[in-house]
């Protein structure tokens, strides 16, 4: 069964800056990746970035830089400043869509005990969506 992992890290140099990394553990080809915060993509969360493997990347503040790391993983840097700044308990979600086969989504947040600059290990927490 395909799974999605989400890793959230606070940057040591900028304490209000976050890096979100997400990956897809499966054999399907990815047609779209959506990163949101405040909850899952279709359940009240706000979209931060959308990455298409061929057509490009769209992002919205406070997203600063979204990019593909591999064919099945992405990273997103959030600029933390002002009202739209993320906080330590913010939930981030990544949805990997493979149209029309299905989509898989998982969420994560900064581990409570993590020190800035130390990354938490990827913890698959899939929310399976049979679209």
């Amino acid at each position: 069964t395909p799974e999605v992992w989400v890793q959230v890290r606070m940057e040591a140099t900028e304490l209000s800056s976050f890096t979100i990394r997400c990956g897809f553990l499966g054999s399907g080809s990815i047609s779209l990746v959506t990163v949101s915060w405040g909850g899952p993509n279709g359940a009240g969360g706000t979209t931060l970035a959308v990455l298409h493997p061929e057509r490009g990347i769209r992002q919205w503040a406070p997203a600063r830089q979204a990019r593909w790391e591999t064919q099945s993983s992405i990273s997103l840097i959030l600029e933390g400043s002002g009202a739209s700044s993320p906080c330590a308990n913010t939930t981030f979600c990544c949805k990997f869509a493979s149209f029309p086969e299905g989509s898989w989504e998982a969420c994560g947040s900064l581990p409570p005990s993590s020190d800035p600059g130390l990354s938490a290990p990827p913890t698959p927490a899939p929310i399976l969506r049979a679209d």
Partner: nanobody, 120 residues
């Protein structure tokens, strides 16, 4: 959670018409297009038509002048009126909600699909 339910597919003779409907519920923030994709047996899926958030319809070349996409915001519904149907229009048709990349509507959510068969 976003849910899209298509209806209206079926068997029709060449030259005939069908109207596909899609009932939408739920919402994904910042999506800015809604449309129809299709996948024929053994062929690549293709975007048939979509409507941008500005309300402008866009069509793939092969259906221009034959298909019409429309929306009913009050009913949260999307429609595809298909006229002068051809055998090559035979496919599973999917209603999608997605994000615009240029003239392309990248599916973020979609329905189960409805089969359209054009045959005599």
């Amino acid at each position: 959670e976003v849910q899209l339910v298509e209806s209206g597919g079926g068997l029709v003779q060449p030259g005939g018409s069908l109207r596909l409907s899609c009932a939408a519920s739920g919402y994904t923030s910042r999506t800015d297009c809604m449309g129809w994709f299709r996948q024929a047996p053994g062929k690549e899926r293709e975007g048939v038509a979509h409507i941008d958030s500005d309300g402008i319809p866009r069509y793939v070349e092969s259906v221009k002048g034959r298909f019409t996409i429309s929306q009913d915001h009050a009913k949260n519904s999307l429609y595809l009126q298909m006229n002068s149907l051809r055998a090559e229009d035979t496919a599973v048709y999917y209603c999608v909600v997605g994000f615009k990349f240029g003239d392309y509507c990248a599916p973020n959510d979609w329905g189960q699909g409805t089969m359209v068969t054009v045959s005599s």
